[in-house]
Interface confidence: medium
């Protein structure tokens, strides 16, 4: 059954910079990935990046660099300065649109006791929706 995992890491070199990694564990082909913060996209969350396998990538501040890591995983680096910068308890969500199953979403945040540069391994997070 499809699952989504989310990993959030604070960069050791820039304490207010975050890296979000998300992956899809399923057999469907990915049509779109949406990364948001502050909650699920469309449910109080704000879109940070949209990644389409063919049409390319769009990102919005404070996102600095969104990219595909593999055919089924992505990473996003966030700038850490300014009023819109994330904090340690910010929730990040990744929504994978997998054809034809629909959308699968999970959210994660920085592990409470993590040191800079460290994070929990990318284990599957609870799936919030499967449309």
């Amino acid at each position: 059954t499809p699952e989504v995992w989310v990993q959030v890491r604070m960069e050791a070199t820039e304490l207010s910079s975050f890296t979000i990694r998300c992956g899809f564990l399923g057999s469907g082909s990915i049509s779109l990935v949406t990364v948001s913060w502050g909650g699920p996209n469309g449910a109080g969350g704000t879109t940070l990046a949209v990644l389409h396998p063919e049409r390319g990538i769009r990102q919005w501040a404070p996102a600095r660099q969104a990219r595909w890591e593999t055919q089924s995983s992505i990473s996003l680096i966030l700038e850490g300065s300014g009023a819109s910068s994330p904090c340690a308890n910010t929730t990040f969500c990744c929504k994978f649109a997998s054809f034809p199953e629909g959308s699968w979403e999970a959210c994660g945040s920085l592990p409470p006791s993590s040191d800079p540069g460290l994070s929990a391994p990318p284990t599957p997070a609870p799936i919030l929706r499967a449309d």
Partner: antibody, heavy 122, light 106 residues
Framework: EVQLVQSGAEVKKPGASVKVSCKAS????????IYWVRQAPGQGLEWMGT????????SYNQKFRGRVTMTRDTSTSTVYMELSSLRSEDTAVYYC???????????????WGQGTLVTVSS | QIVLTQSPATLSLSPGERATLSCSAG?????MHWFQQKPGQAPRLLIY???NLASGVPARFSGSGSGTDYTLTISSLEPEDFAVYYC?????????FGQGTKLEIK
């Protein structure tokens, strides 16, 4: 207003093919996938397949693999479902449905066509 | 394919009563969706992703469950609720529907 309008009823002979159309209006056609469901008289619902209207990618129910073909015409915002080698058990109402959207939060199937009755009889 | 078994096949109740419809999956699924169908009409989405009310659906409808067992509940039946209800899974291809539960007036 969002609408899916299907083509009219068809009567076909066994072995023939039928092509049902589903014309979409009231929304951005390529934002939504379309899927097809059929319902034999007095029976339940059966998923036939889904087409991604943005790139014409398809996923079919293995039961119909080789007999069903789904296509789309973006210039007319129309999706087509063709079923070949018809047999009597293909007699059913065929529905198209607007499937999930990738830019808005969480709808599943929210709009359906009115259905097209296909009768297969010798 | 994942077989969905709905029970009961027919449920006879009166307006104002509580209706509980069950859907059992042959193997575990992430979520269940529920549709309502009235004679001569296309299906209508009621509940998506197990427990989320679709747009325009009255709050008397609710869904719950996990794994292989899912439930659709109608807290107090209205005359317009008498129809056939189908569960659907999208966790595994091919997508499948239950055989339906007919909710009829007692």
């Amino acid at each position: 207003e969002v609408q899916l309008v299907q083509s009219g009823a068809e009567v076909k002979k066994p072995g023939a093919s039928v092509k049902v159309s589903c014309k979409a209006s009231g929304y951005t056609f390529t934002d939504y996938w379309i899927y097809w469901v059929r319902q034999a008289p007095g029976q339940g619902l059966e998923w036939m397949g889904t087409i991604d209207t943005s790139d014409a990618k398809t996923s079919y129910n293995q039961k119909f693999r080789g007999r069903v073909t789904m296509t789309r015409d973006t210039s007319t915002s129309t999706v087509y479902m063709e079923l070949s080698s018809l047999r009597s058990e293909d007699t059913a109402v065929y529905y198209c449905a607007r499937d999930f959207i990738i830019t808005v939060n969480y709808p599943v199937v929210d709009y359906w066509g009115q259905g097209t009755l296909v009768t297969v009889s010798s | 394919q994942i077989v969905l078994t709905q029970s009961p096949a027919t449920l006879s109740l009166s307006p104002g009563e509580r209706a509980t419809l069950s859907c059992s999956a042959g193997s575990s699924v992430n979520y269940m969706h529920w549709f309502q169908q009235k004679p001569g009409q296309a299906p209508r989405l009621l509940i998506y992703s197990t427990s989320n009310l679709a747009s325009g659906v009255p709050a008397r409808f609710s869904g719950s469950g996990s794994g292989t067992d899912y439930t659709l509940t109608i807290s107090s039946l209205e005359p317009e609720d008498f129809a056939v209800y189908y569960c659907q899974q999208r966790s595994s291809l091919p997508f499948t529907f239950g055989q339906g539960t007919k909710l009829e007036i007692k």
